[in-house]
């Protein structure tokens, strides 16, 4: 058993039929010595008396809020949560496996630049009685500070018969050095509690590996005189790290005809312009990627040829 936060404890259980469970001793937080009784949740049934209560925790019916009283007055509470281990593996019932970029990916994180700011998100089908707490650091043995905000519900989607809820959190490395070579990874830890079930999820990454620039901005077409061609130009996104001479991007320019069956033409360029033959109903799209490190491409910025 360990303390998650004040008056909230996690009991780690090997979860299999007829498992013996864990013996837990609860102590009432009071100077009083006698006349103390214990109850569980809203029940008025007295479970025991005395300053301590010894219980065998085997299943979710044994978890919950234990309260010690004296003469009708509440003295203290202890909330017991269960963390299940099945076949040596901690349960992952609360969050959905996103399966990207690989199986057992519960947390996904992205950064728009090298400032040390990043966003993580996760998915669940659970809508109520759900809380999350997020902690982060750079490195684990001698951790350097990363400050995370509160996790918030950021999207709801219908997936077949189920509703899916996306939660996200923003974190900022306290003393980020954008130009430095990273040697220690960022660690992100999410505590998830659903009713009386506790689970924890972790992710470890370098900022350079989770970079995904915003799409190029100001994608514009300028017709060229006496020609079917247009000059396509774009700019670095505002959120990208500066100076751009050091934090450089490369771009993918794609021209797609009106029919999806028509062959796309695409090129890669370090420049911020190109010349395109603009056919009716075609569209021109541009996306960005870090020039020197192959992390994710941005989403496309697109403009119609018309």
């Amino acid at each position: 058993i360990w303390e998650l936060k004040k008056d909230v404890y996690v009991v780690e259980l090997d979860w299999y039929p007829d498992a013996p469970g864990e013996m837990v001793v609860l102590t009432c937080d009071t100077p009083e010595e006698d006349g103390i009784t214990w109850t569980l949740d809203q029940s008025s049934e007295v479970l025991g008396s005395g300053k301590t209560l010894t219980i065998q925790v085997k299943e979710f019916g044994d978890a919950g809020q234990y309260t010690c009283h004296k003469g009708g007055e509440v003295l203290s509470h202890s909330l017991l949560l269960l963390h299940k281990k099945e076949d040596g593996i901690w349960s992952t019932d609360i969050l959905k496996d996103q399966k990207e970029p690989k199986n057992k990916t519960f947390l996904r994180c992205e950064a728009k630049n090298y400032s040390g700011r990043f966003t993580c998100w996760w998915l669940t089908t659970i809508s109520t009685d759900l809380t999350f707490s997020v902690k982060s650091s750079r490195g684990s043995s001698d951790p350097q500070g990363v400050t995370c905000g509160a996790a918030t519900l950021s999207a709801e989607r219908v997936r077949g018969d189920n509703k899916e809820y996306e939660y996200s959190v923003e974190c900022q490395e306290d003393s980020a050095c954008p130009a430095a070579e990273e040697s220690l990874p960022i660690e992100v830890m999410v505590d998830a509690v659903h009713k009386l079930k506790y689970e924890n999820y972790t992710s470890s990454f370098f900022i350079r590996d989770i970079i995904k620039p915003d799409p190029p901005k100001n994608l514009q077409l300028k017709p060229l005189k006496n020609s079917r061609q247009v000059e396509v130009s774009w700019e670095y996104p505002d959120t990208w790290s500066t100076p751009h001479s050091y934090f450089s991007l490369t771009f993918c320019v794609q021209v797609q005809g009106k029919s999806k069956r028509e062959k796309k033409d695409r090129v890669f360029t370090d420049k911020t312009s190109a010349t395109v033959i603009c056919r009716k109903n075609a569209s021109i799209s541009v996306r960005a990627q870090d020039r020197y490190y192959s992390s994710s491409w941005s989403e496309w910025a697109s403009v119609p040829c018309s």
């Epitope: 061609q229 490369t250 320019v253 021209v255 062959k263 033409d265 695409r266 090129v267 890669f268 360029t269 370090d270 190109a274 010349t275 395109v276 033959i277 056919r279």
Partner: nanobody
């Protein structure tokens, strides 16, 4: 792999035009981005113009924008460089180059197949 042979260079007066061409052998020509590069005596090889696989996307060096036009005919396995309003500083050996997926703007190292070059001389 494609093999490249340039032709159509020559001597021309300033203000005149030339249209060198580059013939590629091999059935996979339309899988390649094509580029024209040039090298003047004592100078580094520089990009002049590049064209995408279908010919829809092109790019030009600032020094030739509005004067040169790159085009290709995938049925004939040929890429062209229409050179108008020629200047003495355009004098160089012009090379045709091919690459499947080069990053434009990074120069000659992105290209793995080269022609032997054709001389363009612009007299004043």
């Amino acid at each position: 792999e494609v093999q490249l042979v340039e032709s159509g260079g020559g001597l021309v007066q300033a203000g005149g035009s030339l249209r060198p061409s580059c013939a590629a052998s091999g059935r996979t020509f339309s899988n390649y981005n094509m580029g024209w590069f040039r090298q003047a005596p004592g100078k580094e090889r520089e990009s002049v113009a590049t064209i995408s696989r279908s010919g829809v996307i092109t790019d030009y060096a600032d020094s030739v924008k509005g004067r040169f036009t790159i085009s290709r005919d995938n049925a004939k396995n040929t890429v062209y460089l229409q050179m108008d309003s020629l200047k003495p500083e355009d004098t160089a050996v012009y090379y045709c180059a091919a690459a499947r997926s080069p990053v434009w703007g990074r120069g000659p190292d992105e290209y793995d197949t080269w022609g032997q070059g054709t001389q363009v001389t612009v007299s004043s």
